[in-house]
Interface confidence: low
């Protein structure tokens, strides 16, 4: 009952004499495990016996396997799923039907498999894509309906009998669906492969040839062209003729159109395999090629470079670099279209020929301002001399020249003036755009190139300016030569070196630190009274009356400056001493009498001594002598002596009269 048995295996298996066959097979018996299996060769059902007749290649029963007369047939299956078989080696007479007789406890089944064994190894089959185009990658497939674990084989690709360098990928299939060996080769055919023979060769494990398949490649490609030119070097002169011929060396499919191109642009009305150029001009110089098209596309020949020789064209000059900086290097290049290239050049500067300059380039290592101007050139080749072109301008840039700092003020300049200076220059390229001043004082610049110094100092500043374009050029410094009144005037005592005593010789000096102009006059003053006009003020014998506040003045043409007041101090011993009495020189007894020692002294009196009419010193040392109460016996002449650090002085006698009081007289 077929509904109870399900088999899967290849329908037909292929092999050759001496090889092997591996039959992948699966089955399912729905009513239980397999109990008996017999492999028949070409089985025939015998209706009389209700059994199959035929050669039994393999047999197994529930008692176990029955050894066959040869071990070349193996059942590799099991009792419920696998029915795989192997025949190794396989022989020509194994061709035909293989019958798998299967019996379970209740059911029987005969499964038939076709085996095709050839006398010699059969060839593989090459599969090609429907169309092959040059440079497009294709996959070539070589297929052989054979694979067996016991008989390794290999597939080798050959092009025109030579092994192909490209790596092939070989795969095998031994499944219930299919049994094969396949080799795939990725390949980018070139037009030159068209018509070539590709072979897939079947080899055994040792590389021995077994069989092969061959195909001829049909590679579609654009036309392949060769261009020929007369003259062969493609060098002509204006007026000559040139012939170019286009030859098709290969085209698949056949070509359809022909055209010619110059410098990549199609030439009109040139659709034949020959291009004739008559009386060529220099404009016809260029790269020529022919183009032939077929269904695949256009093919182009190699380019022929046609050179039409002519005399130089009017030249132009290129300057590297302009504007040029003074002192830098400059290169001039003479550019003139010519064929062949010019061999000689003539150079001109401002229309005048530059001697000894015959090269394409002129190099000036150190540019100076006079190099500025128009440069032109003439080129020459074997065909003639060109014309001089318009030329090029060289602009030579340099720092400002001959820069000077100019004082605009009327001279002389006086301290406190506002000084205006200008910065002048002779020439400059490019134009002066700014100015700088040294020293960089905190000054004002009301306009470019002019510096205004307000309230100029006395200290004789030197000023320099720079005129600047891209560079700064400094002028030599100019001295402002500022004139000013005498400075730092002071009184200085020259002698004596120590303190001044009455009677000393004294000299005072009027000093000042500086004056511009140098010519000065001196004035000495005491209490607004002019004393002298020399730098020194001298006292042969100083007296106390000379003491006081002295000033000296120094003046020049700019102005006069006074010193601070200087105090002259004269030291002398006490003098002009006298004794004064209070309330008077006649005093009544019992009252109070005060005697004062008055004096003139410098320094002041430090010590007093009192004397009576007997020249007896009294025990009193202060300036005042107080008698209280005064007695009649105090009457008499008194004098005093004053002492300071310089010396002593004494007063004349002064008489004190003490008279009796009315009370005393009354008692008498």
């Amino acid at each position: 009952d077929s509904s109870k048995w399900v088999f899967e295996h290849p329908e037909t298996l292929y092999a050759w004499e001496g090889a092997c066959v591996w039959i992948p097979c699966t089955y399912r018996a729905l009513d239980g495990d397999l109990e008996s299996f017999i492999l028949f060769h070409n089985p025939e059902y015998n209706k009389n016996t209700s059994k199959f007749d035929g050669t039994r290649l393999y047999e197994s029963t529930k008692d176990g396997k029955v050894p066959s007369e040869q071990k070349r047939v193996q059942f590799l299956g099991d009792k419920n799923k696998n029915c795989t078989l192997s025949i190794h080696p396989v022989h020509l007479n194994d061709s035909g039907q293989l019958g798998l007789r299967m019996e379970s406890k209740t059911e029987k089944w005969m499964e038939r498999i076709h085996l095709n064994v050839s006398e010699r190894p059969f060839p593989p089959h090459i599969q090609l894509p429907p169309e092959i185009q040059e440079s497009q990658e294709v996959t070539l497939t070589c297929l052989l309906n054979f694979s067996c674990y016991g008989y390794p084989i290999q597939l080798q690709w050959l092009l025109e009998g030579v092994p192909m360098r490209q790596a092939a990928v070989t795969s095998t299939s031994l499944t219930i669906k299919s049994v094969f060996t396949r080799s795939e080769l990725k390949f980018s055919p070139q037009w030159s492969h068209h018509g070539k023979i590709v072979t897939c060769q079947l080899q055994d494990a040792d590389g021995k040839f077994l069989s092969n398949d061959t195909v001829q490649l049909n590679v579609k490609h654009t036309p392949k062209l060769e261009i020929k030119v007369t003259p062969s070097d493609a060098i002509v002169r204006e007026g000559d003729s040139v012939t170019m011929t286009c030859e098709v060396s290969s085209s698949n499919p056949e070509y359809t159109t022909v055209s010619w191109l110059k410098d990549g642009t199609s030439l009109k009305k040139q659709n034949t395999f020959t291009l004739n150029l008559r009386e060529v001009t220099k404009d016809q110089s260029g790269k020529y090629c022919c183009q032939v098209s077929n269904d695949v596309g256009p093919g182009r020949s190699e380019e022929v470079f046609l050179q039409v020789q002519y005399a130089p064209e009017p030249s132009t000059v290129q300057i590297l670099h302009s504007p040029a900086v003074e002192g830098s290097q400059v290169e001039f290049l003479c550019m003139s279209l010519a064929n062949p290239l010019p061999t000689n050049y003539t150079w001109y500067h401002n229309g005048k020929e530059m001697q000894g300059r015959t090269e394409e380039k002129v190099h000036i290592p150190k540019i100076l301002p006079w190099h500025a101007g128009t440069y032109s050139c003439v080129a020459e080749n074997i065909l003639g001399t060109g014309q001089r072109g318009p030329g090029a301008e060289l602009d030579v840039q340099y720092p400002p020249k001959k820069v000077t700092t100019v004082i605009q003020n009327p001279m002389p300049i006086r301290e406190g003036d506002t000084v205006t200076l200008s910065c002048n220059y002779n020439s400059s390229n490019p134009s002066v755009t700014r100015y700088e001043w040294k020293p960089h004082g905190a000054w004002e610049e009301p306009s470019l190139g002019v510096l205004k110094i307000q309230n100029v100092g006395w200290d004789n500043t030197t000023i320099a300016c720079a005129a600047c374009n891209s560079w700064c050029s400094w002028a030599s410094p100019v001295a402002l030569n500022v004139q000013y009144a005498p400075r730092d005037v002071r009184v200085r005592k020259i002698k004596p070196l120590s303190e001044i005593h009455s009677g000393n010789s004294v000299s005072l000096q009027c000093d000042f630190s500086s004056s511009h102009p140098k010519e000065v006059q001196f004035f000495w003053e005491k209490n607004g009274r002019l004393l002298g006009k020399e730098s020194q003020l001298n006292f042969d014998s100083i007296s106390p009356e000379d003491a006081g506040s002295y000033s000296c003045w120094v003046n020049n043409s700019i102005g006069q400056t006074a010193s601070k007041a200087w105090t002259l101090e004269v030291l002398y011993a006490p003098r002009r001493l006298r004794v004064s009495m209070s309330p008077g020189d006649q005093v009544m007894e019992g009252k109070s009498a005060t005697l004062t020692c008055e004096s003139d002294a410098n320094p002041p009196v430090s010590h007093y001594t009192w004397f009576d009419w007997n020249n007896q010193s009294l025990p009193y040392h202060s300036q005042k002598l107080r008698l209280e109460p005064v007695k009649v016996q105090h009457s008499g002449a008194y004098w005093c002596q004053g002492t300071n650090s310089v010396g002593k002085g004494r007063s004349p006698l002064s008489t004190l009269t003490v008279y009796y009081s009315p009370e005393t007289i009354g008692r008498r």
């Epitope: 040294k438 020293p439 960089h440 905190a442 610049e445």
Partner: antibody, heavy 120, light 107 residues
């Protein structure tokens, strides 16, 4: 790097004196005018004094004229401000500043300042 | 002496705002004007000199204009770093004088 560093500030009694210094580095000191600017606490900026690059020209605000003296020692790259007869209103942060070339550029570099406090 | 008057004295603005500060001189000072920025506890920084020239390293959002007696400092798009006090200063003649300052604060 152009730098200005002031020093010499401190507490001083009215009528006293103080000398501020400003050490310059990173530029050609003698080529530039220099200036002192002060700022009283919570107030705006007040220009005090300026001196030319050579030291030959000096300029003062009316409020300090006769009491303050600006000077410089180009060999030491140092700017000075001698402040005499100080008053309470002189209390401020004192900045020294570099004056741009020829006064075209204002005061382009400033120090961090030094504080002067005048108080009894 | 030349008096410099700045306005406004205080200005409240937000990040991204266009800010304009004005400075007026009591007499013509040509173009001799500088603008400074000062942050608390720091020294002033020069922004603009000669009325409109941008000091090296100062962002291009700062610009100055004017001549004679009327001058303007403009910040095209205020950034967080720009909140500070700004001073103008004339150096046309001595004594140099500053404006009273404009404090730019966050709105």
């Amino acid at each position: 790097e152009v730098q200005l560093l002031e020093s010499g500030g401190g507490l001083v009694q009215p009528g006293g004196s103080l000398r501020l210094s400003c050490a310059a580095s990173g530029f050609t000191f003698s080529s530039y005018a220099m200036s002192w600017v002060r700022q009283a606490p919570g107030k705006g900026l007040e220009w005090v004094s300026a001196i030319s690059g050579s030291g030959g020209s000096t300029y003062y605000a009316d409020s300090v004229k006769g009491r303050f003296t600006i000077s410089r020692d180009n060999s030491k790259n140092t700017l000075y401000l001698q402040m005499n007869s100080l008053r309470a209103e002189d209390t401020a942060v004192y900045y020294c500043a570099k004056v741009g070339i020829s006064s075209l550029h204002g005061m382009d570099v400033w120090g961090q300042g030094t504080t002067v406090t005048v108080s009894s | 002496d030349i008096q410099m008057t700045q306005s406004p004295s205080t200005l409240s603005a937000s990040v991204g705002d266009r800010v304009t500060i004005t400075c007026r001189a009591s007499q013509s000072i040509s173009s001799w004007l500088a603008w400074y920025q000062q942050k608390p506890g720091k020294a002033p920084k020069l922004l603009i000199y000669k009325a409109s020239s941008l000091e090296s390293g100062v962002p291009s959002r700062f610009s100055g204009s004017g001549s004679g007696t009327e001058f303007t400092l403009t910040i095209s798009s205020l950034q967080p770093d720009d909140f500070a006090t700004y001073y103008c200063q004339q150096y046309e003649r001595f004594p140099w004088t500053f404006g009273g300052g404009t404090k730019v604060e966050i709105k």
